[in-house]
Interface confidence: low
Amino acid sequence: SAPFSFLSNVKYNFMRIIKYEFILNDALNQSIIRANDQYLTAAALHNLDEAVKFDMGAYKSSKDDAKITVILRISKTQLYVTAQDEDQPVLLKEMPEIPKTITGSETNLLFFWETHGTKNYFTSVAHPNLFIATKQDYWVCLAGGPPSITDFQILENQA
């Protein structure tokens, strides 16, 4: 995967929150849930109230990237999804407020959001070949593809 220094000269400026309180379901219709204080996991839920609700914030790149760059926050908290390395769980990082500017190693907080029909992909800005993914009996992690599941459906207005 690409080292952090690969994009260290690019600056990302926060624009606005573009989605509030949405749920992410993977291709097996498993919802992302909180596993503990640090990690997320996926489970098939009867009651979507147990699913994590996310907010999505958009960032603008200093190099005028065509891709939509986003940060993912657990709604009503100060917890942000943070990438580690390949096959490592994504972390929930606590920050007092949404970062106004992100650069260098902090790009592990950012993801490129791509949509193909109803499928949504979140590629790590710090590791551009890796996606947010679910894996059987494991945490939500960063992965390059199968057997991990990298495509998600966004469910909105679940209130």
Epitope: I33, R34, A35, N36, D37, Q38, D49, E50, I74, S75, K76, T77, Q78, L79, L92, E94
Partner: antibody, heavy 122, light 107 residues
Framework: QVQLVESGGGVVQPGRSLRLSCTAS????????VHWVRQAPGKGLEWVAA????????YYAESVKGRFTISRDNSKNILFLQMDSLRLEDTAVYYC???????????????WGQGTLVTFSS | DIQMTQSPSSVSASVGDRVTITCRAS??????LAWYQQKPGKAPKLLIY???NLETGVPSRFSGSGSGSDFTLTISSLQPEDFATYYC?????????FGGGTKVEHR
């Protein structure tokens, strides 16, 4: 089954220190955020402090900030509350509590200990 | 910090009565609210989480409703073992806070 057992309470003089412990069993302690909640005699519940699963994030009520320190030893399944500069208004039963699984620190508290009493000598 | 205000502070009721307790948050907390029952000399017991979800093993006569800043705990038909003090707690902020409590006592 989940068990939380507090210890370390007792009679203390104002201005002195006391260290409470809470020993956990029946679950993977290192996976959960844990809390201290207190209850003064005849009064309601007051949340005191919380610590994240790995001890890296700590949160305190305004009434104890700067005087109390929450910590944990995951290798021994123990939660601590170091109470310094104790005041008469700190008289209370102190409970440790654990959240439901799958939730972060701001959690409903599904499992509680029996409590340990901290009182003051006149 | 988020302040939680419960009312009434006490209520007199008889077995079979329907009892309603309200809780108001000083700011919007979505559905991040829990209800507890406490009996004298005992630790609190979680009844309801996220405003309306019944904790495992809690009788269905207990129910919770509300979102935003106004919430309600209802006991549909009070049983002898339900005489106790009830507390609400917000779980929206990292700094948790409880309501002042409502004592349900014999009429």
């Amino acid at each position: 089954q989940v068990q939380l057992v507090e210890s370390g309470g007792g009679v203390v003089q104002p201005g002195r220190s006391l260290r409470l412990s809470c020993t956990a069993s029946g679950f993977t302690f290192s996976m959960f955020g844990v809390h201290w909640v207190r209850q003064a005699p005849g009064k309601g519940l007051e949340w005191v402090a919380a610590v994240s699963y790995d001890g890296s994030n700590k949160y305190y009520a305004e009434s104890v900030k700067g005087r109390f320190t929450i910590s944990r030893d995951n290798s021994k399944n123990i939660l601590f509350l170091q109470m310094d500069s104790l005041r008469l208004e700190d008289t209370a039963v102190y409970y440790c509590a654990r959240g439901r699984p799958k939730v972060v620190i701001p959690a409903p508290l599904a499992h509680w200990g029996q409590g340990t009493l901290v009182t003051f000598s006149s | 910090d988020i302040q939680m205000t419960q009312s009434p502070s006490s209520v007199s009721a008889s077995v079979g009565d329907r009892v309603t307790i309200t809780c108001r948050a000083s700011q919007g907390i979505s559905s991040w609210l829990a209800w507890y029952q406490q009996k004298p000399g005992k630790a609190p017991k979680l009844l309801i989480y996220e405003a309306s979800n019944l904790e495992t093993g809690v009788p269905s006569r207990f129910s919770g409703s509300g979102s935003g800043s106004d919430f309600t705990l209802t006991i549909s038909s009070l049983q002898p073992e339900d005489f106790a003090t009830y507390y609400c707690q917000q779980t929206s902020s990292f700094l948790l806070s409880f309501g002042g409590g409502t004592k349900v006592e014999h009429r």
